[in-house]
Interface confidence: medium
Amino acid sequence: MMTGTIETTGNISAKKGGSVILQCHLSSTMAQVTQVNWEQHDHSLLAIRNAELGWHIYPAFKDRVAPGPGLGLTLQSLTMNDTGEYFCTYHTYPDGTYRGRIFLEVLESSVAEHSARFQIP
């Protein structure tokens, strides 16, 4: 009988080359968060935040993933391949695991936006 719920940012979008914050929040429980795992759509681990050991960013993502804010994760230098599902898994005491889902859509920067940004007055 687990009492908590995971709140996430749900479906989000961000521009190619930009960055995005993935955020999950565990509420309605006094369970203690002992570890948070962040996984990509293909189940590869991006990062782990352990209450005792701190953050561990997996080598394949070291250049593009920054820990935080809080228990969240910041993805940088986004590519179209980053589109897909992301999962936060909260390991808690005494309840066990809570899992949240976020869908990220990476959008191609339009030519108009690109040219407007660099327009000479």
């Epitope: 687990m2 006094m30 795992n37 782990i48 352990n50 209450a51 005792e52």
Partner: antibody, heavy 121, light 111 residues
Framework: QVQLQQPGAELVRPGASVKLSCKAS????????MNWVKQRPGQGHEWIGM????????RLNQNFLDKATLTVDKSSSTVYLQLSSPTSEDSAVYYC??????????????WGQGTTLTVSS | DIVMTQSPASLVVSLGQRATISCRTS??????????MHWYQQKPGQPPKLLIK???NLESGVPARFSASGSGTDFTLNIHPVEEEDAATYYC?????????FGGGTKLEIK
């Protein structure tokens, strides 16, 4: 030293509610969860539930939702397991066990001696 | 609920020999940091006694002839060399989630 004191035996009539006690001493009472475990003769252990000793937050095994109620009396450092409408199936040894949290990987480090509950008319 | 399958159900081992008990879980009970698996010894008329915590860590005061290993879904408890006082029933237990569950037990006899 840590001690969990339980009455050795209790006799109850079928259908009459019974309240088993577990008195803790020798440690900071409110810093832990207390568990209740059922063991029928010649059988394994069945986890009933747990209660936090500081705020009475509980977690119950779904199988015991209609059977067990966990309470705590901080003034006497005692936890209680109340069993409703007992039948012969409830005849068993009931243990209280302190759960020690080690960064989420919790285990039962101290056990009471157990109360043998007999349900008989 | 996580199902804990212990084997064998009973075991007869000669004094001084090795006893090996297996526990398999229906899903992984390990993270990259810890395994949420523990072993207990129980003798007749007594409560269980914690032997091993977190899959392989010996509880204080437990003799070094007890050892354990494993991760994920497969765990093993070893006793070597077995002594007469080790005759008891041994249980595995997980703390991965609610509800906590126990293995069915392995009764160890010494000959």
């Amino acid at each position: 030293q840590v001690q969990l004191q339980q009455p050795g035996a209790e006799l109850v009539r079928p259908g009459a509610s019974v309240k088993l006690s577990c008195k803790a001493s020798g440690y900071s009472f409110t810093s832990y969860w207390m568990n209740w475990v059922k063991q029928r003769p010649g059988q394994g252990h069945e986890w009933i539930g747990m209660i936090h000793l500081s705020n009475s937050e509980t977690r119950l095994n779904q199988n015991f939702l209609d059977k067990a109620t966990l309470t705590v009396d901080k003034s006497s450092s005692t936890v209680y397991l109340q069993l409703s409408s007992p039948t012969s199936e409830d005849s068993a040894v009931y243990y209280c066990a302190r759960e020690r949290d080690y960064y989420g990987s919790s285990y039962f480090d101290y056990w009471g001696q157990g109360t043998t509950l007999t349900v008989s008319s | 609920d996580i199902v804990m399958t212990q084997s064998p159900a009973s075991l007869v081992v000669s004094l001084g020999q090795r006893a090996t008990i297996s526990c398999r879980t229906s899903q992984s009970v390990s993270t990259s940091s810890y395994s949420y698996m523990h072993w207990y010894q129980q003798k007749p008329g007594q409560p269980p006694k914690l032997l091993i915590k977190n899959a392989s860590n010996l509880e204080s005061g437990v003799p070094a002839r007890f050892s354990a290993s494993g991760s994920g879904t497969d765990f093993t408890l070893n006793i070597h060399p077995v002594e007469e006082e080790d005759a008891a029933t041994y249980y595995c237990q997980h703390s991965w989630e609610i509800p906590r569950t126990f293995g069915g037990g392995t009764k160890l006899e010494i000959k």
